[in-house]
Amino acid sequence: HTAAQDNCTCPTNKMTVCSPDGPGGRCQCRALGSGMAVDCSTLTSKCLLLKARMSAPKNARTLVRPSEHALVDNDGLYDPDCDPEGRFKARQCNQTSVCWCVNSVGVRRTDKGDLSLRCDELVRTHHILIDLRHRPTAGAFNHSDLDAELRRLFRERYRLHPKFVAAVHYEQPTIQIELRQNTSQKAAGDVDIGDAAYYFERDIKGESLFQGRGGLDLRVRGEPLQVERTLIYYLDEIPPKFSMKRLT
C-alpha cells in the first residue's frame, strides 16, 4: 500500500497505525493491539481485527445460539491469540488460565477448561450462514435482484470469489446468505469467508472497518436495504465437542 508520504492510511483497515517507513518510503501499516504488519490491499484477518478492537474496548455483544449444529458467537468479544499469519490459534486462554478451543473464525467449539486443555488443530469453518432481517419496505424485494446485489457486494467490497457465495435465500423479511469454502477450495490469495463475514457484519452494524467511503450503501433497484437484525451461524468441518450439560 502506498500513499502520500505525509498522510498514509490503510484503506481496508481503520484499526491500524501507518507510517511511510517501509522500503523506499512506502506506507507501512500495523494492526493496533498486535503490531503486526497488514496487507492493505485486502481484508485483515478477523483475529487481528478482534485484537485491535480489544485494544480500544467497547461493550461486548451477545448472540443467541439457535441450533445445536451451528455455532454462534455467544461469548462476545475477547482478546485472541493470533499466529504469525494472523489466524486464530486453536487454543485460546484468558487471564485467569481458563482455556478453550476455537474454530477458524475464532468462535469457541469446546467446553472451557484449564491450561491442560489440548486443541490439536485449528478446525476450519467451511459454511457460514448469515441471517438478516430487513426493515419493512413498501413491498418485498425481487429475489433475483436481491441475490445479484448481495453477490455483487461480496465480490466487489470484500473481494470474495463468487464461487464461495453458495446461495442467497429470501422470505420477506428474512434474508439468508450462505458462504461455503472448504480447505481444499481456498487457494492462495483467496479471501477467507470468515473474514468476509466479519467485515460484512461490521458494515451492516454501521461500524465499517474501511477508510474512505466507509459506510455501506446497499440498494436493490434503488430501494435501500436496511438491516435491523443479524445472526451468523458457523458450521465447522469437524463437529464441535461440547458436553451434554451445555446442550440441555
Epitope: H1, T2, A3, A4, N7, C8, T9, C10, P11, T12, C27, C40, S41, R152, L153, E156, R157, F210, Q211, G212, R213, L216, D217, R219, R221, G222, P224
Partner: antibody, heavy 126, light 106 residues
Framework: AVTLDESGGGLQTPGGGLSLVCKAS????????MFWVRQAPGKGLEWVAV????????NYAPAVKGRATISRDNGQSTLRLQLNNLRAEDTGTYYC???????????????????WGHGTEVIVSS | ALALTQPSSVSANPGETVKITCSGG???YGWFQQKSPGIAPVIVI????NRPSDIPSRFSGSKSGSTGTLTITGVQAEDEAVYFC???????????FGAGTTLTVL
C-alpha cells in the same frame, strides 16, 4: 449501446459558474457510480469528482473542492457538475465516466472507469 | 500522492512485447489509451485486469502488490499513443491518474 453525452461547455468568464450535464443511455444508470474527469490542453487526465449510485456520497479533487457540486437524477439518467468561481486553470475538456465497482472500498478509483463520454470543451477566459 | 508514477516514454518494434508500469496507488488500476489530446480516451483495461470486449486480446493488465502493469503482446503500429493509468489514492480517498506514457512504435 452504452453512451454518455456531455453538454454545457463553451466559453466561460473567470469568476463565473458553469453547469455541465451528462445524459446516460444504454444501461441501468441507477446501478453505477459516476465520475467527472477533465483534461487541460496538452496535459494529462485529472480526476474531478465522483458520486455514488444513490447520490448519498460525493467526493472531489482538491483543485475543485468547495467550488464543485456533482449531482445526479436517476429518474432522468443524468449527471451534473456545477463548478463555480471559475479560473483559467479550469479550462479543458470535461468527460463524464461510468464506474464499474460501486461497492468497492476503493470505488473512487479512476481504475474502475469502464465507459467515457465524448467530452465537452470548457474555455475560461476574459 | 499528486500523481501515479509511470514512465514518460517507451518504444518498441512491431511485434515486440511492451510493459508499462504504474505505481503509487492503493487500490485497483485502469489503463486508458489516448491517440490525440481532446479526443476521448479509450479504456483498454479497467479494474486491474478486465479488458473491454472491443479491445484486442494483445492488451492485458495485471497487478502485483501496489504496482499495476499494462502489457501489449505483439505491439502494432496503431498502438502508438499516450497511455494513462488511473487508480486510487488512499491518503485522500480520491481517484488519481498518472502523467501518461508515450508509446512509440519504431
Amino acid at each position: 449501446a452504452v453512451t454518455l453525452d456531455e453538454s454545457g461547455g463553451g466559453l466561460q468568464t473567470p469568476g463565473g459558474g458553469l453547469s455541465l450535464v451528462c445524459k446516460a443511455s444504454g444501461f441501468d444508470f441507477i446501478d453505477y457510480d459516476m465520475f467527472w474527469v477533465r483534461q487541460a490542453p496538452g496535459k494529462g487526465l485529472e480526476w474531478v469528482a465522483v458520486i455514488n449510485r444513490s447520490g448519498s456520497y460525493t467526493n472531489y479533487a482538491p483543485a475543485v473542492k468547495g467550488r464543485a457540486t456533482i449531482s445526479r437524477d436517476n429518474g432522468q439518467s443524468t449527471l451534473r457538475l456545477q463548478l463555480n468561481n471559475l479560473r483559467a486553470e479550469d479550462t479543458g475538456t470535461y468527460y463524464c465516466a461510468r464506474g464499474a465497482c460501486t461497492h468497492c472500498w476503493d470505488a473512487d478509483s479512476a481504475g474502475y472507469i469502464d465507459t467515457w463520454g465524448h467530452g465537452t470543451e470548457v474555455i475560461v477566459s476574459s | 500522492a499528486l500523481a501515479l508514477t509511470q514512465p514518460s516514454s517507451v518504444s518498441a518494434n512491431p511485434g515486440e512485447t511492451v510493459k508499462i508500469t504504474c505505481s503509487g496507488g492503493s487500490g485497483s488500476y485502469g489503463w486508458f489509451q489516448q491517440k490525440s489530446p481532446g479526443i476521448a480516451p479509450v479504456i483498454v483495461i479497467f479494474n486491474d485486469d478486465n479488458r473491454p470486449s472491443d479491445i484486442p486480446s494483445r492488451f492485458s493488465g495485471s497487478k502485483s502488490g501496489s504496482t499495476g502493469t499494462l502489457t501489449i503482446t505483439g505491439v502494432q503500429a496503431e498502438d502508438e499513443a499516450v497511455y494513462f493509468c488511473g487508480g486510487y489514492d488512499g491518503s485522500t480517498d480520491a481517484g488519481i491518474f498518472g502523467a501518461g506514457t508515450t508509446l512509440t512504435v519504431l
